[in-house]
């Protein structure tokens, strides 16, 4: 039975040209996290394997930095970066947990962070 929950940074906004940290946290389970995948819509940005470490897609290596922790930092943001991002936790023995973050990249300088929320 899957008992865990993923807490994410929720709906967030950031300025064009700036950077943002995408963060997820898995709690309420004793399952072993074997890998975390970061995806944007249908594209795989990066993986972080518990043993082998980070592996960043060459398509994104110039604008994506690993961490902090299991999070992902997006740099040199453009309006095209607006959209859904997913953290996918592969765990043993529970299986897969998925968290969702919506990022809005704004032209203006009044970007504010949204509230944190949980996905069961």
């Amino acid at each position: 039975m899957m008992t865990g929950t993923i807490e994410t940074t929720g709906n967030i906004s950031a300025e064009k040209g700036g950077s943002i940290i995408l963060q997820c946290h898995l709690s309420s389970t004793t399952a072993q996290v074997t890998q975390v995948n970061w995806e944007q819509q249908d594209q795989l940005l990066a993986i972080c394997n518990a043993d082998l470490g980070w592996h960043i897609s060459p398509s994104f290596k110039d604008r994506v930095a690993p961490g902090p922790g299991l999070g992902l930092t997006l740099q040199s943001l453009t309006v095209n970066d607006t959209g859904e991002y997913f953290c996918i936790y592969h765990t043993y023995p529970d299986g897969t947990y998925t968290g969702r973050i919506f990022l809005e990249v704004l032209e203006s300088s009044v970007a504010e962070h949204g509230a944190r929320f949980q996905i069961p």
């Epitope: 995806e39 394997n49 043993d51 592996h55 897609s57 398509s59």
Partner: antibody
Framework: EVQLVESGGGLVQPGGSLRLSCAAS????????MSWVRQAPGKGLELVAT????????NLPDSVKGRFTISRDNSKNTLYLQMNSLRAEDTAVYYC???????WGQGTTVTVSS | DIVMTQSHKFMSTSVGDRVSITCKAS??????VAWYQQKPGQSPKLLIY???TRHTGVPDRFTGSRSLTDHTLTISSVQAEDLALYYC?????????FGGGTKLELK
């Protein structure tokens, strides 16, 4: 030049034990996760163990869990695979592999037979 | 576990031919796919990672591509030294799994 040199293979009876070693050179060993991958005669490839760069985390599939142990000594630039309670189906060439499988050793052969 | 199926155990080709080796994933693994070449008596060597990126020193006649769950390694003009076993691998989900291999041989 990245070099991975395995040793320790041989013929062992079912139920016996072996310890494989992999001597690494040509890169900063302590910065890389490492793996053991095996290839049974005439068969495909199977990942049998992975270990974090600092040795603090390991992962083994159910087929070898409880029988095999992966470890490393970063001061000696060496990776190990301790294999206990060996079975005929463990007969294979065992390869030491760096990181995300970018460099492989030449392999060492383990034969489990009575 | 994700199953990577290489439906052709053998493929016959001639020097200079274009050949495509296919691998089908049992579920979507996005671009987390690598390809390896193994010559007789040797260890596997990484050719392609992240579906389409060539590893250091790999000739540009080797290209990788993806269409949903179908992954393809193409050799644009086969050379004699390309006759070997080819394996795909997924690293989208643990445990990482390999295809059964495709042996490229001369007609």
């Amino acid at each position: 030049e990245v070099q991975l040199v395995e040793s320790g293979g041989g013929l062992v009876q079912p139920g016996g034990s072996l310890r494989l070693s992999c001597a690494a050179s040509g890169f900063t060993f302590s910065s890389y996760g490492m793996s053991w991958v095996r290839q049974a005669p005439g068969k495909g490839l199977e990942l049998v163990a992975t270990i974090k760069s600092d040795g603090g985390s390991t992962n083994l599939p159910d087929s070898v869990k409880g029988r095999f142990t992966i470890s490393r000594d970063n001061s000696k630039n060496t990776l190990y695979l301790q294999m206990n309670s060996l079975r005929a189906e463990d007969t294979a060439v065992y390869y030491c592999v760096r990181g995300y499988f970018d460099y492989w050793g030449q392999g060492t052969t383990v034969t489990v037979s009575s | 576990d994700i199953v990577m199926t290489q439906s052709h155990k053998f493929m016959s080709t001639s020097v200079g031919d274009r050949v495509s080796i296919t691998c089908k994933a049992s579920q979507d693994v996005k671009t987390a796919v690598a390809w390896y070449q193994q010559k007789p008596g040797q260890s596997p060597k990484l050719l392609i990672y992240w579906s389409s990126t060539r590893h250091t020193g790999v000739p540009d006649r080797f290209t990788g591509s993806r269409s949903l769950t179908d992954h393809t390694l193409t050799i644009s003009s086969v050379q004699a030294e390309d006759l070997a076993l080819y394996y795909c691998q997924q690293y989208y989900s643990t445990p990482y799994t390999f295809g059964g291999g495709t042996k490229l041989e001369l007609k």
